[in-house]
């Protein structure tokens, strides 16, 4: 229940990739505005996105303070031009979000193959260690810094001349694989967090092939 000219937000949804985290909701406002609050289970509420007509709020700055905490957000609805007005129970109408634990739930962004280098019959494939917005000691941490050995990469590789794929895994950002001399290979990688039950895998990286600019060849 609430005032006759405000409706409660609904379909509150967390959209999070590599810890960049946005809360989205419906409906598009008609004669109303929204304010968002976020809190950890044991913490105080902090207000964000004051009196906005948007239906999303970037909460990254809050969740990166401790990505292993569980967060709850709520979206308050106010009549436009009369934000002091409250619902029938004497407080603004609001709706709670689902709980969100960034470390366990943020989607893994599409990885990128940074480089590959062939030395004889070995190829070293390096995955770009993407920077996140998580900070420690005033430094932005990489995905590997945050997840450590919890994060692995799966490499798919195949001869340019055939369709048969092979795979390898690493819990660093580098693969060292055996190849046939004189053959060109293509590569794609996928990030995985084996211990998770949801949002476990990223999409595959763009395919990179030998004979193109990212690679180096040495005898």
């Amino acid at each position: 229940s609430g005032t006759t000219n405000t409706v409660a937000a609904y379909n509150l949804t967390w959209k999070s990739t590599n810890f960049k985290t946005i809360l989205e909701w419906e409906p598009k406002p008609v004669n109303q505005v929204y304010t968002v609050q976020i809190s950890t289970k044991s913490g105080d509420w902090k207000s964000k996105c004051f009196y906005t007509t948007d239906t999303e709020c970037d909460l990254t700055d809050e969740i990166v303070k401790d990505v292993k905490q569980t967060y709850l957000a709520r979206v308050f609805s106010y009549p436009a031009g009369n934000v002091e007005s409250t619902g029938s129970a004497g407080e603004p109408l609001y709706e709670n979000s689902p709980e969100f634990t960034p470390y366990l739930e943020t989607n893994l962004g599409q990885p990128t193959i940074q480089s590959f280098e062939q030395v004889g019959t070995k190829v070293n494939v390096t995955v770009e260690d993407e920077r996140t917005l998580v900070r420690r000691n005033n430094t932005f941490l990489s995905l590997r810094d945050v997840f450590g050995k919890d994060l692995i990469y799966t490499l798919y590789y195949w001869k340019s001349s055939s369709s048969g794929k092979k795979t390898a895994k690493t819990n660093t950002n580098e693969f060292l694989i055996d190849v046939d001399k004189g053959e060109n290979y293509c590569f794609s990688v996928q990030a995985v967090i084996p211990s998770r039950t949801v949002n476990r895998k990223s999409t595959d990286s763009p395919v990179e092939c030998m004979g193109q600019e990212k690679g180096e060849f040495r005898e």
Partner: antibody, heavy 117, light 107 residues
Amino acid sequence: EVQLVESGGGLVQPGGSLRLSCAASGFNIKDYYMHWVRQAPGKGLEWVGWIDPENGNTIYDPKFQDRFTISADTSKNTAYLQMNSLRAEDTAVYYCARDTAAYFDYWGQGTLVTVSS
Amino acid sequence: DIQMTQSPSSLSASVGDRVTITCKASRDIKSYLSWYQQKPGKAPKLLIYYETGWAEGVPSRFSGSGSGTDFTLTISSLQPEDFATYYCLQHGESPFTFGQGTKVEIK
């Protein structure tokens, strides 16, 4: 509860084909890798191949690459193993297994394939 | 391809004995090794992963050690329900390969 149930095994003549199914419940196969492993009577375990059901990527032991095809239908939450040009030495119990990328944590009960004339 | 050499192929032991099974990889597989127990007519069951981590519900008498190329599964005090066949699996690169298996029998 996580469960994998294989079906489709049976008696087939040499040169014949068979399609095995692995029906998953209690999780979405697209979130995991799915493998097929076989075991000939009285012998050890032999890895056949895997699929990432989300993108269709498949990897095989090269010895099976030409005759076996792994596929998946995420709407049915089921993985498949299509086996062609079957030989007597393909007689085995075929298992499907779920892979977290760190280990195979759940296995089906297996389905017996017998290749004989 | 990576070969996994498992030994012994079989062993006889008594309840309460300490049992050690080894797996040797033909080249470095880092931590991508897991151990499985299989009883007759049943599917394999995960015991140990990342060479040292316990699977859910696995008794602490089972332990894993090693890295690189040499790995060991130890059963500190064999129990009646432990008589089974044990397999190692390398899943660091394809084709994934199992050891030949070790059958643990009652002495």
